[in-house]
């Protein structure tokens, strides 16, 4: 019986460890600067790295610019978006800017898109200063179903900071749905 | 056999609970205001509380101003940095400020330092207002290996808000590495 | 013995799954716009949704405007607060604003209230621009005891953005206390 108990414990440790890893999807996606749209309008950002630098993904899928949930659960979602402008990057056409991020959830089964989180600021970036910078951070806890998609929309995409430590978003599963 | 099963279940509950706790390192470090560097340049903040007020640490080490990882895993890292200035503190050297935070990871084995997250804003803190305040929040999900060190760099350290609810950083382990 | 082992494994899977769910309280509360206080002073926000839209709660209690902890543990707490003003809403009483959030913990057993996190910014919202917006995000890892209460205080509540994606706060349990 002791041998059996050891076997039970052993198999359980393996099973518990394995199931725990399987049960915790995550992603951290960093901006792909080679493909940032221009313009000052609100756009969906579709180019992100998931497999280089700090970018990583497990038990979730990145496709067509969207982070796809493969496993029902409650997830903590976050985004950090940095905007910047240097006078050498061109003259600002307006000093009054609305620098915003929207984290959206799209359900394919019932075609609909909803904003989960938003953040940002109106800014006055005058031509008197040679450099301007502003970062937004949002985060929250949401119930996500398999097949649902998370995407990021921003205003003024041409002002995005292309560094991997500056513009990124991510998610990690915290717990199952009851 | 029933007694044995009860023993298996019992030992398992203890083991599961114990291993779960051991597997979840965390830290929440609050600024040590008695030792904030002066100046407006970018500096590494080395004085943090880990054992008073909201400061706490478990299965991680705080040494030489750095938060040291003791256990491989995926961690959620965060930082909240507040800057403030009151006219009674004297005039600012410049009204145009770059208030920034950088969360960096240093690997001792392969001596190298990388910025994981950055945030902040350029600000115009004019003399027309007697009080100025600004906070930055960043957060993200990162793979950390045992021995790696997390540290915080800021610009304009003399403007830091010394309250424990204002200037802090932290980490908690979410899951093991596969 | 094999049958017994299967039974052990089976009951354990149920027990583990059940205890895991029970061990992970959470809440995501979104602003109730029908009851936002007016004025520019600092107030406690007492009206939040916990059961509609993105609002949700499990193994925690929402009562009298406070999020009550039912289970000891270490929790990640977060808040996102958006302020906005459009010229059609009338003139601002002052162009110099202090837009702040304070996440506080109240202990009933030892009557006391403490600020866990704060964030915000002083802003100059001039009449030259027809629209102004600003968001704050804070987050941190805290030890909470059963019966303790979390609440949100803000300055300038009349400027709050009433959208559920804009103004919210939440918590989720990460681990037990040793």
């Amino acid at each position: 019986i002791r041998a059996e108990k050891a076997m039970v414990d052993g198999s359980w440790l393996d099973l518990a460890k394995r199931s725990k890893l399987e049960a915790q999807p995550f992603a951290h996606l960093t901006i792909n600067a080679t493909d940032i749209p221009s313009g000052s309008h609100k756009v969906s950002l579709s180019s992100w790295y998931h497999d280089r630098g700090w970018g990583k993904i497990s038990n979730m899928t990145f496709s067509n610019g969207k982070l796809i949930v493969n496993q029902d659960g409650f997830y903590y979602l976050y985004a950090n978006i940095c905007f910047r402008h240097h006078e050498t990057s061109g003259d600002l056409a307006t000093e009054y800017l609305q620098l915003m991020v929207y984290v959206t959830k799209t359900s394919i089964k019932i075609p609909s898109s909803h904003t989960l989180m938003k953040g940002g600021s109106t800014k006055y970036w005058s031509g008197n200063s040679e450099f301007h910078f502003y970062s937004i951070n949002v985060g929250g806890f949401f119930k996500l179903r398999s097949g649902e998609e998370i995407s990021i929309e921003v205003s003024n995409p041409s002002l995005l900071d292309p560094d991997q430590d500056a513009t990124y978003f991510g998610a990690f599963k915290v717990r199952d749905i009851d | 056999i029933r007694a044995e099963k009860a023993m298996v279940d019992g030992s398992w509950l203890d083991l599961a609970k114990r291993s779960k706790l051991e597997a979840q390192p965390f830290a929440h470090l609050t600024i040590n205001a008695t030792d904030i560097p002066s100046g407006s340049h970018k500096v590494s903040l080395s004085s943090w509380y880990h054992d008073r007020g909201w400061g706490k640490i478990s299965n991680m080490t705080f040494s030489n101003g750095k938060l040291i990882v003791n256990q491989d895993g995926f961690y959620y890292l965060y930082a909240n940095i507040c800057f403030r200035h009151h006219e009674t503190s004297g005039d600012l050297a410049t009204e145009y400020l770059q208030l920034m935070v950088y969360v960096t990871k240093t690997s001792i084995k392969i001596p190298s330092s990388h910025t994981l997250m950055k945030g902040g804003s350029t600000k115009y803190w004019s003399g027309n207002s007697e009080f100025h305040f600004y906070s930055i929040n960043v957060g993200g999900f990162f793979k950390l290996r045992s021995g790696e060190e997390i540290s915080i760099e800021v610009s304009n350290p003399s403007l830091l808000d010394p309250d424990q609810d204002a200037t802090y950083f932290g980490a908690f382990k979410v899951r093991d590495i596969d | 013995i094999r049958a017994e082992k299967a039974m052990v494994d089976g009951s354990w899977l149920d027990l583990a799954k059940r205890s895991k769910l029970e061990a992970q309280p959470f809440a995501h509360l979104t602003i109730n716009a029908t009851d936002i206080p007016s004025g520019s002073h600092k107030v406690s926000l007492s009206s939040w949704y916990h059961d509609r839209g993105w609002g949700k709660i499990s193994n925690m209690t929402f009562s009298n405007g406070k999020l009550i902890v039912n289970q000891d543990g270490f929790y990640y707490l977060y808040a996102n607060i958006c302020f906005r003003h459009h010229e059609t809403s009338g003139d601002l009483a002052t162009e110099y604003l202090q837009l702040m959030v304070y996440v506080t913990k109240t202990s009933i057993k030892i009557p006391s209230s403490h600020t866990l996190m704060k964030g915000g910014s002083t802003k100059y919202w001039s009449g030259n621009s027809e629209f102004h917006f600003y968001s704050i995000n804070v987050g941190g890892f805290f030890k909470l005891r059963s019966g303790e209460e979390i609440s949100i205080e803000v300055s300038n509540p009349s400027l709050l953005d009433p959208d559920q994606d804009a103004t919210y706060f939440g918590a989720f349990k990460v681990r037990d206390i040793d």
Partner: antibody, heavy 122, light 108 residues
């Protein structure tokens, strides 16, 4: 239809001053950045100066910095270029041009006015 | 500042032929922020292309732009009599905004 009409050009001696105007119509003038671009006789195009829609920020080519001042009167839908300390090399046709307003960075020029000739000579 | 060099200086072609104009930048043009203009004698320039490849309103589809980084091209697939003029490229990815010296497309 968007229309831009420049005026104020003419003959001026070196060291002299001139003020160019550009009357705009057919669009919400205050919402768009505007620029001046010049073209010396038989030469290419050179951007001279730009101004944001509000008039709060102004930009200049190094060749005219400190001598030229761009401004606008949004109530009159008019753009100005005050040119001081004029030199022979400032001789050119001066065009006013509208920014597209679709990017946060001042970008291409569309449309252009018909231009006004400035001749700096003794 | 970014220097734009256009080639050839002059292009002699007949109506119906294909014209290929080159614009080379001294450093990479950020975000494909490049425009093309056509200027006829005694007239103001007219916008043809922006964003390296987007046609302006009312521009015939025989005009097309391509390229990125430092090398950009304007192509006129079949020259019409009214197309003969001077063509300029302009970058707006960095300050100051600069123009190429122009390519003259003349009737052969």
């Amino acid at each position: 239809e968007v229309q831009l009409l420049e005026s104020g050009g003419g003959l001026v001696q070196p060291g002299g001053s001139l003020r160019l105007s550009c009357a705009a119509s057919g669009f919400t003038f205050s919402s768009y950045a505007m620029s001046w671009v010049r073209q010396a006789p038989g030469k290419g195009l050179e951007w001279v100066s730009g101004i944001t829609g509000s008039g709060g920020s102004t930009y200049y080519a190094d060749s005219v910095k400190g001598r030229f001042t761009i401004s606008r009167d949004n109530s009159k839908n008019t753009l100005y270029l005050q040119m001081n300390s004029l030199r022979a090399e400032d001789t050119a046709v001066y065009y006013c041009a509208k920014d597209p307003g679709t990017t946060v960075i001042m970008s291409w020029f569309d449309p252009w006015g018909q231009g006004t000739l400035v001749t700096v000579s003794s | 500042e970014i220097v734009l060099t256009q080639s050839p200086g002059t292009l002699s072609l007949s109506p119906g032929e294909r014209a290929t104009l080159s614009c080379r930048a001294s450093q990479s043009v950020r975000g494909r922020y490049l425009a093309w203009y056509q200027q006829k004698p005694g007239q103001a320039p007219r916008l043809l292309i922006y964003g390296a490849s987007s046609r302006a309103t009312g521009i015939p589809d025989r005009f097309s732009g391509s390229g990125s980084g430092t090398d950009f091209t304007l192509t006129i697939s079949r020259l019409e009599p009214e197309d003969f003029a001077v063509f300029y490229c302009q970058q707006y990815g960095s300050s100051p905004r600069t123009f190429g010296q122009g390519t003259k497309v003349e009737i052969k």
